[in-house]
Amino acid sequence: LFEVKNNGTTCIMASFSASFLTTYETANGSQIVNISLPASAEVLKNGSSCGKENVSDPSLTITFGRGYLLTLNFTRNATRYSVQLMSFVYNLSDTHLFPNASSKEIKTVESITDIRADIDKKYRCVSGTQVHMNNVTVTLHDATIQAYLSNSSFSRGETRCEQDRPSPTTAPPAPPSPSPSPVPKSPSVDKYNVSGTNGTCLLASMGLQLNLTYERKDNTTVTRLLNINPNKTSASGSCGAHLVTLELHSEGTTVLLFQFGMNASSSRFFLQGIQLNTILPDARDPAFKAANGSLRALQATVGNSYKCNAEEHVRVTKAFSVNIFKVWVQAFKVEGGQFGSVEECLLDENSMHHHHHH
């Protein structure tokens, strides 16, 4: 059991086992190691806090091994609290876990999560909760987590994770949908921006189309193209030194998350992760989830913008890809809330109808 206390009062309690599926580079290519949270793991007291009014939110940092850190940063509103950000620090110079690693540096990866619960209830997830980060997938097993405690023990009530909930036995009848579905028209282009304390960290203009392959209740496999309708979509996000996120909530049933990373040595930003949670009423399993945190798309130098008039296909998983139309994006460094110098995609540069953007 991991506890964070302030003046003897517990404000965060957590109990879980965790594994960290980590990809790292060697001279002979990529290697994968699965690190388990050991029984000796403990709360890092000076890295954990109950939060300070108007200054910081509660956080739990767990330390283990040779400098490994797992941090859960919490936030809340009137009715719910969540793990807003999870970060993992690992040490590539640890030859026991990372033999022949090309780099010997200490790496930090982070991601937003969908760990959330009602205030005054514990978050409970027996099934694995996966959080995808750049080169690392964290899986929490048999998790019980609660923040914003007032009486130093887990609440009686609980909010169960989606994976633990039984599938509804009767789903509303879905309209019959031919296989394959008719191709919808191109999605509308919308502008998105994300700002933090230091100003704008993401500008994007794009049309988004989801390409989903799934099994229907009648055992047939169908591929559907779904356009994200900007008029029915709300955008939010976060700015971080190493991670910029754009979170789109569409029509009450779809959450599409874009994570942009930065390569500090080459000063380039790129789309590193996409997560999708949506409901497909006619699917055998209506809750459709897909994620990939190891993408390398929409790349440009920090301070510049990436632009592509041609349709781009970003493959997330076997069953899910995103078709991005007329994309213009800039992450991390956005001067004066305007797009910087344009770096065009190869598809545009090779095009007969090449347009110059000034």
Partner: antibody, heavy 118, light 106 residues
Framework: QVQLQQSGAELVKPGASVKMSCKAS????????IHWVKKSPGQGLEWIGA????????PYSQKFKDKATLTADKSSSTTYMQLSRLTSEDSAVYYC???????????WGQGTLVSVSA | DIQMTQSPPSLSASLGGKVTITCKAS??????MAWYQDKPGKGPRLLIH???TLQPGIPSRFSGSGSGRDYSFSISNLEPEDIATYYC????????FGGGTKLEIK
Amino acid sequence: QVQLQQSGAELVKPGASVKMSCKASGYIFTNYNIHWVKKSPGQGLEWIGAIYPGNGDAPYSQKFKDKATLTADKSSSTTYMQLSRLTSEDSAVYYCVRANWDVAFAYWGQGTLVSVSA
Amino acid sequence: DIQMTQSPPSLSASLGGKVTITCKASQDIDRYMAWYQDKPGKGPRLLIHDTSTLQPGIPSRFSGSGSGRDYSFSISNLEPEDIATYYCLQYDNLWTFGGGTKLEIK
């Protein structure tokens, strides 16, 4: 000990607005939601909404979402409720309440009487 | 919003007798149920929370039970000071009061 001190009674004209206050003391203001409850002879007790003073997030009852506006001032540990477009139906006693952990509405203010009359 | 249906709206009972009030939620509220006593000119008084847990200082004549969507509240050995209006309140998902039950003594 926990105390919630509400502002005094209000006599207002139909169509006008009224803003009442609830000053909290005896606990960390941003750690708990403050709820507002209406008590009237015709409708009994009705939950209006709540505010989390930490970030101003305020869920409302469907019935009151166009009637009430909740705000909080962290510097003075005070929560406010504004009622707009008042009618005689809004004549009631309004309470601010702090919920306790896993306990519904444990600490109540003394109430603010609002009378709407031409 | 969750709806709470409280019944009966009013009831009359004899001193020393027993009364029971019921509340039905429009969905499962996981025992997040409280009961209040309200008297004219006074603030509401919390009697029971978490379906059956008596608040400190509340006599054991008051009791509550239930689960899922159905809950009940009882007062046994009725006394004159029990004349009041009683309300149920769900606090599982946002908050909703029942319509109230006015208790009178015969």
